[in-house]
Interface confidence: low
């Protein structure tokens, strides 16, 4: 079963999928359409990185213009480089801008 | 059925500006991005830029930032290009082409374009 | 911006014959290629998407291949109709580029 076959069989379950299978997923070239991305939850899109969502949407990280003003996207281009946004030609904007430090917020509540 | 509507010529003078129209029918507008494509007589393509219907968010290749201006109105499913300070240099066909919002660009469909003519 | 170049302007070939038409993009565009078909006076029209997959109505005998930088548009058992400027398009990043164009010509 390739990719995009299995990725089918297991759409309906992914809404409440964890980051780690969504990394999992972006190695296995299934082309994740935005209608289902959309559905994912924000704290599980939030730690991946730009080139995992973009293997993750294959074709249709195109469509991530489309929805920068909706969560999840636009909580998760908050979260990344400038830098890394602008790699996607896509025009997203409002990405950590460059030479800024990114704290690990998720460490420093564990510590408090 | 897509169909896409462009007028045939426009001629305008060097220095004027002109806009460009293309009605859409057959799909849902807003739906789609609206891509221009420029070709002069016996030349390649160059891609100007594109508008997104359902909210107005444009991308252009920079070459096109200061000639082009691309608009929609979704009450007419029309998207409108408007090319300034012309010169010669921009006497070409102009056409325009929409692609899902969903996908990566690939054009499946063209308007049979606008010759524009600049001439003194 | 990404350049996409077809070294071959024109290309001459016999109608039953099997041309290639090539495109080499700058940077790696992954399959994110196009193929179109413009004849003289008319729009455009689209013949294959992501490198290697035909557009509904585009007859068989149109293929494109190629990943990475390499890409090739081959048209086996070559018609009259098939007369024609053909172009590559990269939508891999902003701003779209497209190839210079080959002009296939029957002899």
């Known amino acids: 079963m390739n990719g995009s076959e299995y990725f089918v069989k297991i759409q309906s379950f992914l809404g409440g999928a964890p980051t780690e299978d969504l990394k999992a997923l972006s190695q296995q070239n299934v082309s994740m359409d935005l209608a289902t991305f959309m559905k994912l939850r924000t704290d599980a899109v939030l730690p991946l990185t730009v080139a995992e969502v973009q293997k993750l949407l294959g074709p249709h990280v195109e469509g991530l213009k489309a929805e920068e003003r909706h969560r999840p996207v636009r909580d998760w281009i908050l979260r990344q480089r400038q830098d890394d946004l602008d790699t996607l030609g896509l025009g997203l904007q409002g990405g950590i801008p460059n030479g800024y430090l990114v704290l690990d917020l998720s460490m420093q509540e564990a510590l408090s | 059925q897509v169909q896409l509507q462009q007028p045939g010529t426009e001629l305008v003078k060097p220095g004027a500006s002109v806009k460009l129209s293309c009605k859409a029918s057959?799909?849902?507008?807003?739906?789609?991005?609206m891509h221009w494509v420029k070709q002069r007589p016996g030349q390649g393509l160059e891609w100007i830029g594109n508008?997104?219907?359902?909210?107005?968010?444009?991308n252009y290749n920079e070459k096109f930032k200061n000639k082009a201006t691309l608009t929609v109105d979704k009450s007419s499913s029309t998207a409108d290009m408007q090319l300034n300070s012309l010169t010669s240099e921009d006497s070409a066909v102009y056409y325009c082409?929409?692609?899902?919002?969903?996908?990566?660009?690939?054009?499946?469909?063209w308007g049979q374009g606008t010759l524009v003519t600049v001439s003194g | 911006d990404i350049v996409m170049t077809q070294s071959q302007k024109f290309m001459s070939t016999s109608v039953g014959d099997r041309v290639s038409v090539t495109c080499k993009a700058s940077?790696?565009?992954?399959?994110?290629i196009a193929w179109y078909q413009q004849k003289p006076g008319q729009s455009p029209k689209a013949l294959i998407y992501?490198?290697?997959y035909r557009y509904s109505g585009v007859p068989d005998r149109f293929t494109g291949s190629g990943s990475g930088t390499d890409f090739t548009l081959t048209i086996t058992n070559v018609q009259s109709e098939d007369l024609a400027e053909y172009f590559c398009?990269?939508?891999?990043?902003?701003?779209?580029?497209f190839g210079g164009g080959t002009k296939v010509e029957i002899k």
């Open positions: 082409a929409p692609h899902y919002i969903g996908s990566r660009p690939g054009f499946a469909y």
């Open positions: 057959g799909y849902t507008f807003t739906s789609y991005w």
């Open positions: 508008v997104n219907p359902s909210n107005g968010g444009s």
């Open positions: 940077q790696n565009v992954g399959t994110n």
């Open positions: 992501s490198a290697s």
């Open positions: 398009q990269q939508y891999n990043s902003y701003p779209l580029t």
